[in-house]
Amino acid sequence: EICGPGIDIRNDYQQLKRLENCTVIEGYLHILLISKAEDYRSYRFPKLTVITEYLLLFRVAGLESLGDLFPNLTVIRGWKLFYNYALVIFEMTNLKDIGLYNLRNITRGAIRIEKNADLCYLSTVDWSLILDAVSNNYIVGNKPPKECGDLCPGTMEEKPMCEKTTINNEYNYRCWTTNRCQKMCPSTCGKRACTENNECCHPECLGSCSAPDNDTACVACRHYYYAGVCVPACPPNTYRFEGWRCVDRDFCANILSAESSDSEGFVIHDGECMQECPSGFIRNGSQSMYCIPCEGPCPKVCEEEKKTKTIDSVTSAQMLQGCTIFKGNLLINIRRGNNIASELENFMGLIEVVTGYVKIRHSHALVSLSFLKNLRLILGEEQLEGNYSFYVLDNQNLQQLWDWDHRNLTIKAGKMYFAFNPKLCVSEIYRMEEVTGTKGRQSKGDINTRNNGERASCESDVLHFTSTTTSKNRIIITWHRYRPPDYRDLISFTVYYKEAPFKNVTEYDGQDACGSNSWNMVDVDLPPNKDVEPGILLHGLKPWTQYAVYVKAVTLTMVENDHIRGAKSEILYIRTNASVPSIPLDVLSASNSSSQLIVKWNPPSLPNGNLSYYIVRWQRQPQDGYLYRHNYCSKDKIPIRKYADGTIDIEEVTENPKTEVCGGEKGPCCACPKTEAEKQAEKEEAEYRKVFENFLHNSIFVPRPE
């Protein structure tokens, strides 16, 4: 029986009965928050062989091993993951071993086994036989291995039953528990699974099989399952579903959801039955099961029941996330906020059409309206009194409407009104009239030339750069000395710069009146010598990174015709020089024969330029004599099992942490202080743990249903 879609067992251990007839869990399996220690010995689910998503165990008191619960769990597919993990075992206070002795394959994702104070038999499992890549596994804060004394079957009797593999240069027996070996298939099978008798399964099998070379005898399928057979691809008129089986159109049409309406049911796209059209596609009509590509961003119509949506905070803007067409009116009233411009762009940046009017008033936090970066049409189907469809009143810091060189905005019906916007130049408003097609609609009082732009440098001259020099982490720029009509009106210059991977930034990007600004700012005083051109050295930059830079002259206010005369440059794009890349990551080496080494690595996190090749160096090392001093055939006295507290030790502390023998005749000395890199790594590690724990808690703690 296929169970799903996802099973959550919590609070009451008797809920485990829900798994009774499951052979495949289509979705996830959560077993968590069972605080009363119970006897799980009567619970056994031998039918369960596959979990298509992930397995999560969290705070289940009294459970000592998973082997009795799931003796035949063979594959966890990881089609969807829990924070990148397909197997999570977290804060399982009584778990002594994992014991999933039939687990042969975790198809996607890593494992996270953390803060399990009594958990042993972790170093005896070779996860590389189960997962493709072990580098992302996270196994910390469990019982220290030296307190476990993990023994594989037969070791004490000197008749070892398990096979050996090498992990971290340690060649050892591999087992799940004191009486269960880790199964390994003969090398002749290659990547194929095998039966209990070591016969190779059919190539389409995954994990195991009941008969050799038979695609109907697989425990799980490598690709897809259809009508009792493992197939490499779904046959005609069937569709991939949940990453593991083939279903027909009727099946797909009959999947229900409590979250969405029946007209938003599953769709068939690109040979797959899926919950919704993928990014960039939309349903081919409201009653269709099929997807077609969107032209531009996919449309999402949002409607306000009260006709007018007031945006007075990030929270209210959040309701418009993803909307491309807004049916109603927008009233923007942002008086304060943190990082408001980029937050608004995040939530309102896709809006293309507003069917009613747009009113911006008392929005003192706004410097620009560029957060509405895709607005192209205001229909004006509903207008404010006086027939206004675009109304801008009393915005003390508004300096820019949009970047009209890169913006087409049409106002289909209605007039514009602008008043009491002291930093908004009238020329900017006139430009909007031309672009939007509203020129001639406004009457004289609709655009007030006295109280718009009264405190702005509206008649701007252009500053020209004269030279630029770059190194790997510095840029030197100079520009023409600006000479206003009265030299005393020039106070200083401000240089603005930021990383700009693409040449599409504007002066007002990410800028608001509450201090948030995506640009770095540096003040540059006037050179005392009137003939010297002003300039600046920007340092601490990243190698091989494109920066955008512009300069503004800072001038005294109220100069000509009661308006400020100012100057600024165009935006200059400039790239720093290349530099030495950081070290390649995750270097792994393994020997696959007596004369070969296979070395793998990931690219450096900071390439600092275009990588063209890698240099691999190697040298022969003398054999370490220490390896011969110990008789590895004798098993030393097994350490006493001491209960660990489940906290995470960053390092194992010796008896006397203050003194370490530092070699030679130096005698005892203090432990070496941690390097900055080590401290940073520890800090990041702790941060990563916190992020995961928050994610876990946020995912699993839900309010009780009423």
Epitope: E26, N254, I255, S257, D262, S263, Q287, M289
Partner: antibody, heavy 118, light 107 residues
Framework: EVQLVQSGGGLVKPGGSLRLSCAAS????????MHWVRQAPGKGLEWISV???????YYADSVKGRFTISRDNAKNSLYLQMNSLRAEDTAVYYC????????????WGQGTTVTVSS | EIVLTQSPGTLSVSPGERATLSCRAS??????LHWYQQKPGQAPRLLIK???QSLSGIPDRFSGSGSGTDFTLTISRLEPEDFAVYYC?????????FGQGTKVEIK
């Protein structure tokens, strides 16, 4: 011929249990969502539960926690396990496949009577 | 849950006349509304699906209209076999719900 044949109704005491069955034929049972609908004597239709093709189950508030819908695709059968029965559960129970956006197919069982009385 | 309210509760019409039945939803359900006919001792029979889509085998005197919250079933000329109880049913959101029914009787 597409049909649904019901069984399992009868007289039961309050607090008792009963299991209704519905056997499907003439269509690919596993590819369709299946519903239970009931009708109390002289009253209107009341939707009570559905199980979709994945096995996901949904219930009306009036039966949540007491009734369990399940299916066995190998046997082409739909079930309704009714526990903690009350007098107000007395009704004719229908199993049905209700059409959806993409199909007009709408199939109902003949109905089976459940009487809850002491 | 979405509540469906049918009106009138009973409709008395003469054969050959037109009958108009109404169904109102407590919130917008798009076009996910269906009309059923039920005769005594029988299981319901689907007449109209998704507000206005007719089904094969159903006489074309039955038609449906509406979307959002207001829906109508129209029987253009009542035949003797049309006297029955009519139910609307929404499938837009789970749990599904039925209206309380409209009884169409001979005047």
């Amino acid at each position: 011929e597409v049909q649904l044949v019901q069984s399992g109704g009868g007289l039961v005491k309050p607090g008792g249990s009963l299991r209704l069955s519905c056997a499907a034929s003439g269509f690919t049972f596993s590819s369709f969502a299946m519903h239970w609908v009931r009708q109390a004597p002289g009253k209107g239709l009341e939707w009570i539960s559905v199980i979709d093709t994945r096995g996901a189950t949904y219930y009306a508030d009036s039966v949540k926690g007491r009734f369990t819908i399940s299916r066995d695709n190998a046997k082409n059968s739909l079930y309704l396990q009714m526990n903690s029965l009350r007098a107000e559960d007395t009704a004719v129970y229908y199993c049905a496949h209700l059409g959806n956006f993409y199909y007009g197919m709408d199939v109902w069982g003949q109905g089976t009577t459940v009487t809850v009385s002491s | 849950e979405i509540v469906l309210t049918q009106s009138p509760g009973t409709l008395s019409v003469s054969p050959g006349e037109r009958a108009t039945l109404s169904c109102r939803a407590s919130q917008s359900i798009g076009s996910s509304l269906h009309w059923y006919q039920q005769k005594p001792g029988q299981a319901p029979r689907l007449l109209i699906k998704y507000a206005s889509q007719s089904l094969s085998g159903i006489p074309d005197r039955f038609s449906g209209s509406g979307s959002g919250t207001d829906f109508t079933l129209t029987i253009s000329r009542l035949e003797p076999e049309d006297f029955a109880v009519y139910y609307c049913h929404q499938s837009s959101r789970l749990p599904h719900t039925f209206g309380q029914g409209t009884k169409v009787e001979i005047k």
